[in-house]
């Protein structure tokens, strides 16, 4: 029978009763960066090449006994995950080894790095189709193997890391927190985080996705026919290298950007259990399972976004964070989270010749988030609409006043420190969608964006009793791209997208003691573009 | 049900062509390895070799590399076993089998094609 | 390649009586990843195809009658036969699947005495 995480992989139109999909990956080459593999097992013999390279430290202690069988076991396995007849992700797929890791599994930044390197020459001599690079290793944090992936990715490679097994933030892990690389942690059969001893998966901001990575069936050193099951979030990276590989067959053109976006669209949806995650960590950690997409075709005409979080601010006073779209990706909206609720909210502002989003931390605040709404839109124009504080009691309110130019999203900043404790609530004059409001002692950004055939609308879902969460979603066939609250009189803590729903988180009312603070309202900014609808249509 | 069906009995002459072919039914072909082996008369049973019919992936014993070819055909669910040009010492009954990777054993084995090579 | 050496070559046991095979492989066919051994015994009667007796060295295929069983572990294995039937006569081989070349053992032959 198929094996579990076969089958938690494969959309329900794929399944019989074996692992067939429709394209095995074919026109991809994957490199992995690994240990030694045993390249005549019968699950990968002719699919992987073993290449020349060969960098790693020697061994520690002087009664290591070199058994090739044990030296091979991580990299078999893993090229087996990946691609291999019977047990792998993408059949079809051709994998090239480097080995930079030893017999115990241990190898260098610079191994690492002269791995990527020789890559990255090797693409230059014979340029072939799609790469897809896997590192199924994690150390700690290096700005110069993050650089390095860097590099390789804006080369056009796609790089699949495994986020660790520290039961850690993976932020502090290399190539792990490379926001270039695609990071996958590993969850169970029961869709849970995966425990390995007293540590488990890594988690947090710098993770994308996970896949399986818990008693994981693959090819095994010790025989030309044994099979073995393994555990980590190097198995999840490889299911990944695996659904990237079979994407990138049928589409050979998506740039990272657009593979990243939908590995995210397609993955199943809040079928983790968040409470396995530190708390601080469960809101920036995100709750997809990778799969295969339901069809390897005709995912072109829909609008893809995803969240981005910063780093966390730190609590000094004038702290910022500030979160940042890949560059083929818009920033179509900016948000703030501070899970004390002192913050000064957050704005758009251009840095580099592209917007980011920045997060004001205030004072007595023990930090902020940074949160970015980053979405696929080909041939955009944005920009951002300010209007400072008014000085009107009615609050501070701006329009996307250019001519074919719809609102994206809203941010609202302001100088004084508690702002929203006990002012008046705004409310939106009804018939103006287009605008977004705000206190009159907040500055308001509206992201204004024109895109062939785009289109948006508002949507709130407001609750008069205070609420810890209020979340109000976009319907089928529509893609948050903004995720913003009514100013009201309750506290809030600040908003962010969860897939297509906004989440306004407030402060706990057990906590506050009160009820008489009032209404707290979601707002979600919904769009979806006519224009990519028609092209996909016109392709098939 | 699960069913490996094999070509007729072949007489040749030395020198000959010949391919012989084994058909499975009632399970997915191309998820099995089919395995080809050799019974000369009143001997023992000898490996020769095996395909993987999802890909055509093959392997040969040492002793049957570079004298036979195995092949197979996804499309009609068929394995074959051919020479170029039969020996006198290549009559014996030949087997395919089917083993799955989680079962590299041969559970299902096809009825024997008996080729006999005489001048 | 590893070499599965059988014996006896040729075995003729009364009906009702036990009936004992031993195949010895030239290196081991145990693997630590799995703790399997990678072993399997057939049954070829005259003019049929083999027919999958024991696989993993010691598990029945579904439809073999109980009174087949087999042990050992690493190198040395059995084929136990506890009450020999008449329609038991046939040649027995056992056969390694961990490493390529697969390879059988001679055989033993299982006649009534």
């Known amino acids: 029978s198929i094996p579990w995480n076969l089958e938690r992989i494969t959309p329900p139109r794929y399944r019989a009763d074996e692992y067939q999909p429709p394209d095995g990956g074919s026109l991809v080459e994957v490199y992995l960066l690994d240990t030694s593999i045993q390249s005549d097992h019968r699950e990968i013999e002719g699919r992987v090449m073993v290449t020349d390279f060969e960098n790693v430290p020697e061994e520690d202690g002087t009664r290591f006994h070199r058994q090739a069988s044990k030296c091979d076991s991580h990299g078999t396995h893993l090229a087996g995950v990946v691609s291999g007849r019977d047990a792998g992700v993408a059949k079809g797929a051709s994998m090239r080894s480097l080995r930079v890791l030893n017999c115990q599994g241990k190898g260098t930044v610079s191994g690492t790095l002269i791995g990527l390197e020789f890559i990255r020459k090797s693409q230059l001599v014979q340029p072939v189709g799609p790469l897809v690079v896997l590192l199924p290793l994690a150390g700690g944090y290096s700005r110069v193997l993050n650089a390095a992936c860097q590099r390789l990715a804006r080369a056009g490679v796609v790089l699949v890391t495994a986020a660790g097994n520290f039961r850690d933030d993976a932020c502090l892990y290399s190539p792990a927190s490379a926001p270039e690389v695609i990071t996958v942690g590993a969850t169970n059969a029961q869709d849970q985080p995966v425990t390995l001893g007293t540590l488990g998966t890594n988690f947090g901001r710098c993770v994308d996705l996970f896949a399986p990575g818990e008693d994981i069936i693959g090819a095994s050193s010790d025989c030309s026919t044994c099979f073995v099951s393994q555990s980590g979030t190097s198995q999840a990276a490889a299911h990944v290298a695996g659904i990237a590989a079979m994407m990138l067959s049928a589409e050979p053109e998506l740039t990272l950007a657009e593979l990243r976006q939908r590995l995210i669209h397609f993955s199943a949806k809040d079928v983790i259990n968040e409470a396995w995650f530190p708390e601080d960590q469960r809101v920036l950690t995100p709750n997809l399972v990778a799969a295969l997409p339901p069809s390897t075709h005709g995912a072109g005409w829909q609008l893809f976004c995803r969240t981005v979080w910063s780093a966390h601010s730190g609590p000094t006073r004038m702290a910022t964070a500030v979160a940042r779209c890949a560059p083929d990706e818009e920033l179509l909206s900016c948000s703030s989270f501070s899970r004390s609720g002192k913050r000064r909210g957050e704005r758009m502002e251009a840095q580099g010749g592209k917007l980011v989003c920045r997060a004001h931390n205030a004072f007595g605040g023990e930090g902020v988030y940074a949160i970015a709404r980053c979405c696929l839109l080909p041939q955009a124009n944005c920009s951002v609409h300010t209007a400072p504080p008014a000085e009107a009691s009615m609050g501070t309110r701006v329009h996307c006043h250019q001519q074919g130019h719809v609102l994206t999203g809203c941010s609202s900043h302001w100088e004084v420190e508690d702002l929203g404790t006990h002012k008046p609530p705004v409310l939106r004059p009804r018939g103006q969608p287009n605008q977004c409001v705000g206190h009159r002692e907040a500055s308001i950004h509206a992201s204004c964006c024109h895109a062939p055939g785009l289109e948006c609308k508002v949507k709130e879902h407001g609750i008069p009793a205070p609420q810890e969460q209020v979340t109000v979603a976009c319907e089928e066939g529509w893609t948050l791209t903004g995720c913003s609250a009514l100013p009201g009189t309750s506290h809030v803590l600040g908003a962010y997208a969860v897939d297509n729903t906004c989440v306004v988180r407030s402060r706990d009312v057990s906590t506050t003691g009160s009820t008489s603070e009032g209404a707290v309202t979601a707002v979600a900014i919904c769009c979806r573009s006519r224009h990519l609808a028609q092209a996909s249509q016109e392709l098939q | 049900q699960v069913q490996l069906v094999q070509s007729g009995a072949e007489v040749k002459k030395p020198g000959e062509s010949l391919k012989i072919s084994c058909k499975g039914s009632?399970?997915?072909?191309?998820?099995?390895?089919i395995t080809w082996v050799r019974q000369m008369p009143g001997k023992g049973l000898e490996w020769m070799g095996m395909?993987?019919?999802?890909?055509?992936?093959?392997r040969y014993s040492p002793k049957f590399q570079g004298q036979v070819t195995i092949s197979a055909d996804k499309s009609i669910s068929t394995a074959y076993l051919q020479w170029s040009s039969l020996k006198a010492s290549d009559t014996a009954m030949y087997y395919c089998?089917?083993?799955?990777?989680?079962?590299?054993?041969?559970?299902?084995w096809g009825q024997g094609t008996l080729v006999t090579v005489s001048s | 390649d590893i070499v599965m050496t059988q014996s006896p070559d040729s075995l003729a046991v009364s009906l009702g009586e036990r009936a004992t095979i031993n195949c010895r492989s030239s290196?081991?066919?145990?693997?630590?990843?799995?703790?399997?051994?990678?072993l399997a015994w057939y049954q070829q009667k005259p003019g049929q195809p083999p027919k999958l007796l024991i696989y993993?060295?010691?598990t029945r295929e579904s439809g073999v009658p109980d009174r087949f069983s087999g042990s050992g572990s690493g190198t040395d294995f059995t084929l136990t036969i506890s009450s020999l039937q008449a329609e038991d006569v046939a040649v027995y081989y056992c056969?390694?699947?961990?490493?390529?070349?697969?390879?059988f053992g001679q055989g033993t032959k299982v006649e009534i005495k």
């Open positions: 089998a089917r083993d799955y990777w989680s079962k590299p054993f041969f559970d299902v």
């Open positions: 009632g399970y997915s072909f191309t998820d099995y390895y």
């Open positions: 395909i993987y019919p999802g890909d055509s992936y093959t």
């Open positions: 290196q081991s066919v145990l693997y630590s990843s799995n703790n399997k051994n990678y």
């Open positions: 993993w060295a010691s």
């Open positions: 056969q390694q699947y961990s490493s390529f070349p697969i390879t």
